[in-house]
Amino acid sequence: LQDPCSNCPAGTFCDNNRNQICSPCPPNSFSSAGGQRTCDICRQCKGVFRTRKECSSTSNAECDCTPGFHCLGAGCSMCEQDCKQGQELTKKGCKDCCFGTFNDQKRGICRPWTNCSLDGKSVLVNGTKERDVVCGPSPADLSPGASSVTPPAPAREPGHSPQ
């Protein structure tokens, strides 16, 4: 014998209190598949969460995070704060990158500047908290007449380009 509830489409539920007829999901609830005996409560996007997609009778609401935060976890279950460029998120909040490291994004960790000398190159532009070092030609390429590029003068302030 076929289960009469199997005929109930998404957006409805099989109402046992009404001879198993298909009733529409009540407001703020949904059923995403047919044959359901209950409708699920819609997710509410509150606080630091904001609504990306409204709940309908057949699909749950979808949330994302308010500006200054980004999603983590399945279905954006958590909101993690953004940091500024030149910072990294630590357990105690956003902290500036230590000297010799940089972060050019709003998330992720500070990474060490490129060591130009490992590739036999010179530093063309000093690194900052927000930007990596730019490596220039190798010193051997800078023989007189070979190039008009000259190595930069040492920065006065560590980690920053000369003003």
Epitope: E88, L89, T90, K91, K92, K95, I109
Partner: nanobody
Framework: EVQLLESGGGLVQPGGSLRLSCAAS????????MSWVRQAPEKGLEWVSA????????YYADSVKGRFTISRDNSKNTLYLQMDSLKAEDTAVYYC?????????????????WGQGTTVTVSS
């Protein structure tokens, strides 16, 4: 599959206590530091506490120091958070999180797996 499942949340009055548990599976539990992190209704994630893989080192956010105690039972693959002297501002969803290394500290933010969370409401 790596999984973390929190339990123990609920409604408690200010000054009361709760003990949260986090059951871990799918990885060598004792090889990884673990953290508790929370998200209050209007705020982003806030790190609460961390414990090293062996359980010998523990760390706490200033906001919970002296009130919360983190522990682990590696034979049961379970992480705990004992919360005493609870305040209204402790109301949040609490997540346990696996860190990427055995040792931990109160600085580096390297959680790589999260549970689904358990809700703690502190209200009179």
């Amino acid at each position: 599959e790596v999984q973390l499942l929190e339990s123990g949340g609920g409604l408690v009055q200010p000054g009361g206590s709760l003990r949260l548990s986090c059951a871990a599976s799918g990885f060598t539990f004792s090889s990884y530091a673990m953290s508790w992190v929370r998200q209050a209704p209007e705020k982003g994630l806030e790190w609460v506490s961390a414990i090293s893989g062996g359980g010998g080192s523990t760390y706490y956010a200033d906001s919970v120091k002296g009130r919360f105690t983190i522990s682990r039972d590696n034979s049961k693959n379970t992480l705990y958070l004992q919360m005493d002297s609870l305040k209204a501002e402790d109301t949040a969803v609490y997540y346990c999180a696996k860190e990427g290394t055995t040792e931990t500290d109160d600085y580096h933010y390297n959680m790589d797996v999260w549970g689904q969370g358990t809700t703690v409401t502190v209200s009179s």
